[in-house]
């Protein structure tokens, strides 16, 4: 028995944030869950991860030098992604397992979600900048 | 057959590092709901749950513990591995290895691997 | 975390008699009509043995003397007719809630 997950085909970043909604055939409410956002055809990346708890609020964490926050629905986690560069379009994927009360479950791999970075090129500002015009 | 087998006793001084490992054999570590579980038993002691490893390569641990114990899987050699680290007395019991289903209750068992933490 | 108390600590019994073994949950450990509740029998110096899964489920190749009840946070482990190979120590398991936690085990003994 798998979990399904919906993602968006495609989304685009134009201000170097976006919020990718993983919509899931299974109602989190009251369990014990981990909800993962991978990079990659090959999922090698974790760029977030959101862990809900019947006892403690969500903790949302990344390990990988990604800006991410995380909402929880009923059916859902929405992974909320600031500062991400250009060469960080690619294809993205959820991911969910539910731990307790059992059973185990984890979901089908989705189609993932293909994230283009439109926004502006990240660059670190100058330690002069010119006068500003009015 | 389905069994897990687990290497044999160690002696640690406190402070150190154990690592204990367990074969798999007639099931997959890759097979769904399947997770390999720890759990210790100390001396004339009850049963204390140490943590787990599914099939997905997730990882799920005792708080109690957390902070000192790896758990990993080799699943090319079908192998769970359990390390504690920072050992103390207390830590001193017999370490099993237990096939878990996906409503966690144990299965197949290892045969035990007896880790004695002494100075 | 969940506690569970088995009572008795131990017993002594004959062979031919009837046991029961009763373990208490510090809350329910039920979810969507299970019972996330297991039996395990172990002997000295081996690894416990799974005897009953999800409250009254018999593991495969466990004799039919064997059976579990109970839903909520009551529940027992009944031997019908006590075998020799049966003395050994019980415990119950609960899987409902993180950490998975034991009983602290009853001692079944020959009288």
């Known amino acids: 028995n798998k979990i399904l997950v919906k993602q968006s085909p495609m989304l685009v970043a134009y201000d170097n944030a976006v919020n990718l909604s993983c919509k899931y055939s299974y109602n989190l409410f009251s369990r014990e869950f981990r909800a993962s956002l991978h990079k990659g055809l090959d999922s090698a990346v974790e760029v977030c991860v959101v862990y809900g708890n019947y006892s403690q609020q969500l903790q949302v964490y990344s390990k990988t030098g990604f800006n991410c926050d995380g909402k929880l629905g009923n059916e859902s986690v929405t992974f909320y992604l600031q500062n991400l560069y250009v060469n960080q379009t690619d294809i993205y994927f959820c991911k969910i397992e539910v731990m307790y009360p059992p059973p185990y479950l984890d979901n089908e791999k989705s189609n993932g979600t293909i994230i283009h970075v439109k926004g502006k090129h990240l660059c670190p500002s100058p330690l002069f900048p010119g006068p500003s015009k009015p | 057959q389905v069994q897990l087998v687990q290497s044999g006793a160690e002696v640690k001084k406190p402070g150190s590092s154990v690592k204990v490992s367990c074969k798999a054999s007639?099931?997959?570590?890759?097979?769904?709901?399947?997770?390999v579980a720890w759990i210790r038993q100390a001396p004339g002691q009850g049963l204390e749950w140490i943590g787990q490893?599914?099939?997905?390569?997730?990882?799920y641990y005792n708080p109690s513990l957390k902070s000192r114990v790896t758990i990993t899987a080799d699943k090319s050699t079908s192998t769970a591995y359990m390390e504690l680290s920072s050992l103390r007395s207390e830590d001193t019991a017999v370490y099993y290895c237990?096939?878990?289903?996906?409503?966690?209750?144990?299965?197949?068992w290892g045969q035990g691997t007896l880790v004695t933490v002494s100075s | 975390d969940i506690q569970l108390t088995q009572s008795p600590s131990s017993l002594s019994a004959s062979v031919g008699d009837r046991v029961t073994i009763t373990c208490r949950a510090s809350?329910?450990?039920?979810?969507?009509?299970?019972?996330?509740l297991d039996w395990y029998q172990q002997k000295p110096g081996k690894a416990p043995k799974l005897l009953i899964y999800?409250?009254?489920s018999l593991e495969s190749g466990v004799p039919s003397r064997f059976s579990g009840s109970g839903s909520g946070t009551d529940f027992t482990l009944t031997i019908s007719s006590l075998q020799p190979e049966d003395f050994a120590t019980y415990y119950c398991?609960?899987?409902?809630?993180?950490?998975?936690?034991f009983g602290q085990g009853t001692k079944v003994e020959i009288k």
């Open positions: 237990a096939r878990s289903s996906a409503h966690y209750y144990f299965d197949v």
């Open positions: 007639g099931f997959s570590l890759s097979t769904g709901g399947v997770a």
């Open positions: 490893i599914y099939y997905s390569g997730s990882t």
């Open positions: 809350e329910s450990v039920d979810f969507q009509g299970i019972s996330f």
């Open positions: 999800d409250a009254s």
């Open positions: 398991q609960q899987s409902y809630r993180s950490p998975i936690t």
